[in-house]
């Protein structure tokens, strides 16, 4: 995705046209993705009874979805800006394979699923610009991701529905924690 341009000559004449700050963009980006997830969850919950299911643990064993932990420095107690930013970027990079999996999982919200995926890529770019310690960010191995994707797609229908539900729920929780943390930075 193209990265937004910086200030141009118009900015001098019209102060309101100065580019949004990095924080403003990131905040909008996350709020938009959360809104998209909400729309996708609506379709998932309407289509199946996964949202009320108590058998989540069965499917969760197959997944290694990113989660915020105390050590990541994103919570109010023990908040650490740099550690937290690395965790957010690393987590988003890890979620990318799961967002790819979601691409063929929706009928009426197919475009919305694509928009969530694209918006997440843009968010990662913005956050990488913000991070000082890019070396600490581990990028997932493409081969591992490819085999994970194949494995997820080979699951039976029930497990695929449950996986979709769990990805959306976990991604929502991860983004909500990220948004709270980024607002403190």
């Amino acid at each position: 995705a193209p990265v937004p341009p910086g200030e141009d000559s118009k900015d001098v004449a019209a102060p309101h046209r100065q580019p949004l700050t990095s924080s403003e963009r990131i905040d909008k980006q996350i709020r938009y993705i959360l809104d998209g997830i909400s729309a996708l969850r609506k379709e998932t919950c309407n289509k199946s009874n996964m949202c009320e299911s108590s058998k989540e643990a069965l499917a969760e064993n197959n997944l290694n979805l990113p989660k915020m932990a105390e050590k990541d420095g994103c919570f109010q107690s023990g908040f650490n800006e740099e550690t937290c930013l690395v965790k957010i970027i690393t987590g988003l990079l890890e979620f990318e394979v799961y967002l790819e999996y979601l691409q063929n999982r929706f009928e009426s919200s197919e475009e919305q699923a694509r928009a969530v995926q694209m918006s997440t890529k843009v968010l990662i770019q913005f956050l990488q610009k913000k991070a000082k310690n890019l070396d600490a960010i581990t990028t997932p191995d493409p081969t591992t991701n490819a085999s994970l994707l194949t494995k997820l797609q080979a699951q039976n229908q029930w497990l695929q529905d449950m996986t979709t539900h769990l990805i959306l729920r976990s991604f929502k929780e991860f983004l909500q924690s990220s948004l709270r943390a980024l607002r403190q930075m």
Epitope: A1, K28, Y32, D35, A115, M118, S119, V122
Partner: nanobody, 117 residues
Framework: QVKLEESGGGLVQPGGSLRLSCAAS????????MGWYRQAPGKQRELVAD???????MYADSVKGRFTISRDNTKNTVYLQMNSLKPEDTAVYYC???????????WGQGAQVTVSS
């Protein structure tokens, strides 16, 4: 190229109401956040309110309970209903559209709102 056109600004007494509208024309992506920023003379630009295409809203603390943002996706239009206006609401109000799938945005030319007796 997207064009944002504001209307509805003007002079109003304290305690009065105004409704701003902003219509987007051109090839606008339906995945966007439409909103309003304002800038008073000598002050920083600030976000007043915005709304996603799914209807999720965000307001500045200073306008909560007084201003209401809404949108009509079929008309690519965003509205700002401003009630209980105060002199400190005096500013140029700019319509803004943000496209999260690219990170780009568009601005309107602005509508002057003056709250004075």
């Amino acid at each position: 190229q997207v064009k944002l056109e504001e209307s509805g600004g003007g002079l109003v007494q304290p305690g009065g109401s105004l409704r701003l509208s902003c219509a987007a024309s051109g090839s606008i992506s339906r995945f966007n956040i439409m909103g309003w920023y304002r800038q008073a003379p000598g002050k920083q630009r600030e976000l007043v309110a915005d709304i996603t295409n799914g209807g999720t809203t965000m307001y500045a603390d200073s306008v909560k309970g007084r201003f209401t943002i809404s949108r009509d996706n079929t008309k690519n239009t965003v509205y700002l209903q401003m009630n209980s206006l105060k002199p400190e609401d005096t500013a140029v109000y700019y319509c803004h559209t943000y496209y999260p799938t690219t990170g780009f945005d568009d601005w309107g030319q602005g509508a002057q709102v003056t709250v004075s007796s």
